[in-house]
């Protein structure tokens, strides 16, 4: 009955502060509406990074001011988080909810540790 969610253990953000990873879920039912949430866990505190609801077969749409973008293909979601800085290094959990039709299912991934290294400032040129 439990819904399994898989995501990579570790991802290194690019020098531009962009990190991408795949969140894959094994759907126990034939969901038509799915909600995907990215959570950040730090010191046992959990906060929402971004969330999007999508209809199966349609594109994943985050709010305009979201730091996340993504695409969906079947039971797989490709997530991209932008604007990351070194202080954002942490565990990012993919949460999947099958909202419709009933029954509701919840899936929680083990989390992806995203490492962000701030780029060194360019030296002044004479």
């Amino acid at each position: 009955k439990a819904m399994h969610v898989a995501q990579p253990a570790v991802v290194l953000a690019s020098s531009r502060g962009i990190a991408s990873f795949v969140c894959e879920y094994a759907s126990p039912g034939k969901a038509t509406e799915v909600r995907v949430t990215v959570l950040r866990q730090a010191d046992s505190q959990v906060t929402e990074v971004c969330a999007a609801t999508y209809m199966m077969g349609n594109e994943l749409t985050f709010l305009d001011d979201s730091i996340c973008t993504g695409t969906s293909s079947g039971n797989q979601v490709n997530l991209t988080i932008q604007g990351l800085r070194a202080m954002d290094t942490g565990l990012y959990i993919c949460k999947v909810e099958l909202m419709y039709p009933p029954p509701y299912y919840l899936g929680i991934g083990n989390g992806t540790q995203i490492y962000v290294i701030d780029p060194e400032p360019c030296p002044d040129s004479d």
Partner: antibody, heavy 118, light 108 residues
């Protein structure tokens, strides 16, 4: 701090209606799924109904399906439970509860007592 | 519907003793979706453990959870006077959300 305060309980005759409210504060109410859970006198906890963060999805226990309606007003930070065709077996303390980010019911109200009796 | 069965119904122990409470599910529950709650007379339930073994904010480390699949355990390593209460397990991985019938931990 997170606070959930239920109101609207009381004594009502079988077949009548009652509406419970749950006022939320201390968090962004519109971001969280919510539930109602009840507890009959001297008994265990029974999940009653669920509503999604945006109010678009609702689920009910078989025991209340067709009689109870859950709703929310995110502009007022308030959760509701409309109870119709009440029965003696609906007598219980009704709690509203918040779904935490990882799924458990992380905050509960103090409860409001509903007594269905003639 | 996932049915949760708790045992024993009542546990009579003395302060300082170890309490072991069991919760068995009628079908497999992912460990990410099992919680334990404590309820004292006249009070609302309080979240103790989520994800089978993670302690909720402010919960002392004498409370610990374990298990997977269909068998889960809540352990209180050394009972304090304030720990005498009723404990419920719950699964939240699928609807309908279900609770066990509770285990009462009483003073011997």
């Amino acid at each position: 701090q997170v606070q959930l305060v239920e109101s609207g309980g009381g004594v009502v005759q079988p077949g009548r209606s009652l509406r419970l409210s749950c006022a939320a504060s201390g968090f962004t109410f519109s971001s969280y799924h919510m539930h109602w859970v009840r507890q009959a006198p001297g008994k265990g906890l029974e999940w009653v109904t669920f509503i999604s963060y945006d109010g678009n999805h609702k689920y009910y226990a078989d025991s209340v399906k067709g009689r109870f309606t859950i709703s929310r007003d995110n502009s007022k930070n308030t959760l509701y439970l409309q109870m119709n065709s009440l029965r003696a077996e609906d007598t219980a303390i009704y709690y509203c509860a918040r779904t935490g980010w990882l799924g458990p019911f992380d905050y509960w109200g103090q409860g409001t007592l509903v007594t269905v009796s003639s | 519907e996932i049915v949760l069965t708790q045992s024993p119904g009542t546990l009579s122990l003395s302060p300082g003793e170890r309490a072991t409470l069991s919760c068995r599910a009628s079908q497999s529950v992912g460990s990410s979706y099992l919680a334990w709650y404590q309820q004292k007379p006249g009070q609302a339930p309080r979240l103790l453990i989520y994800g089978a073994f993670s302690r909720a904010t402010g919960i002392p480390d004498r409370f610990s959870g374990s298990g997977s699949g269909t068998d889960f355990t809540l352990t209180i390593s050394r009972l304090e006077p304030e720990d005498f209460a009723v404990y419920y397990c719950q699964q939240y991985g699928s609807s309908p959300w279900t609770f066990g019938q509770g285990t009462k931990v009483e003073i011997k």
